[in-house]
Amino acid sequence: GSMGHAPKVGRLIYTAGGYFRQSLSYLEAYNPSDGTWLDLADLQVPRSGLAGCVVGGLLYAVGGRNNSPDGNTDSSALDCYNPMTNQWSPCAPMSVPRNRIGVGVIDGHIYAVGGSHGCIHHNSVERYEPERDEWHLVAPMLTRRIGVGVAVLNRLLYAVGGFDGTNRLNSAECYYPERNEWRMITAMNTIRSGAGVCVLHNCIYAAGGYDGQDQLNSVERYDVETETWTFVAPMKHRRSALGITVHQGRIYVLGGYDGHTFLDSVECYDPDTDTWSEVTRMTSGRSGVGVAVTME
């Protein structure tokens, strides 16, 4: 990535890190309004299996691992990128390394969910307070989950699917911050680990993933009112370890692995027409990226 100043633009889709032959340090941003990609400041340490989120206009890269020819190191790191200066700075690390982590943001606090450290699959969850630069453990999930999809809806944190070390999962659970407790919710129709999970129009979407046999292109959404999962249109590509985000009322999925190829494909879902379309390609194929969208 270049180290010059990033142009001051509106809402961008950021993709950080990922994996292709080894963990990557790329930070790139896609501007859906004109279809261009920006090459931004590299992560200080390459990582895949990380998660991305935005708090207060700053992009955070959370967890993952550095899988390189020199070795394989799971990451407890939290790093903060300032789009105005195009610079990364380290923040307080998590209590444990978390590869294939999920993250969500509630009231400006980052929740780091599950992930793995070596052969340990975490059910632990911790919360970061940016103003104090501190992490604190909260109640653990009811299930160990790596490759977990995390989303926030109505100030509740949902952990969806993943892998407990023995089985890929279709189960999902919900965290209530006021009670500091987790409760199971209706299981998905499909086992999904490494799915893309996000919130759009009061529904939680789970896209793609891996069911223990194959990569998936199916997509389902959870209606919190009816507590049911319903299939919507499938993606054009099967993919696991994909990136996902929502931009202006549409879902974007980025990259992933289809069982043969590291995808550069970016697809966009329009809920009004229940259709997926290919909108762009990343500059190279990769899986295990961290993705987030800047605020206005």
Partner: antibody, heavy 120, light 107 residues
Framework: EVQLVESGGGLVQPGGSLRLSCAAS????????IHWVRQAPGKGLEWVAS????????LYAKSVAGRFTISADTSKNTAYLQMNSLRAEDTAVYYC?????????????WGQGTLVTVSS | DIQMTQSPSSLSASVGDRVTITCRAS??????VAWYQQKPGKAPKLLIY???SLYSGVPSRFSGSRSGTDFTLTISSLQPEDFATYYC?????????FGQGTKVEIK
Amino acid sequence: EVQLVESGGGLVQPGGSLRLSCAASGFAISASSIHWVRQAPGKGLEWVASIDPETGETLYAKSVAGRFTISADTSKNTAYLQMNSLRAEDTAVYYCAREYAWWYAAADYWGQGTLVTVSS
Amino acid sequence: DIQMTQSPSSLSASVGDRVTITCRASQSVSSAVAWYQQKPGKAPKLLIYSASSLYSGVPSRFSGSRSGTDFTLTISSLQPEDFATYYCQQSYSFPSTFGQGTKVEIK
């Protein structure tokens, strides 16, 4: 019946290349991590490389990193080990093995092995 | 890398004997240890996974146990087909590493 059959071994000069194949039957390689493990003549077992079917990520022993590449073709239900810049110390029987479960990372099915000899 | 120090490197025993093989990890590996049996010219066979779980189809005379970073494979009553080399393997930390092997020979 689960079976793994390696092929592609042989005699190669130092600095040369070989591509080993591991043909699986009785299970889908898309459902398990596949490992390569080697055993030098009269010596013990050494883990070499593995590939994760979910993320596509690969791992390598330091002794082979940058020279060996593991891959899988799910349409052929076959895994591969591309070995470049071979050295005398790479001489060994190479086994492919199926991971029993990620949590345990133990290999429950192994191929019969293929001998790679690196010598001038 | 985590070292798995296996002992003894060889032992002589008779049919019906109780045989114990030990592996000591250089640091904590939790219970992520497997044991294999290998006969000359053959591939290894999985006996024990997760330190103490008997793999399907393996005779119950084989057992595994853990005490901290020490792992033990026990054959309660040695049978003629058990004369082989045995290896431990840790998969807790990258890279996975094996013990150097224990050859069980006929006394």
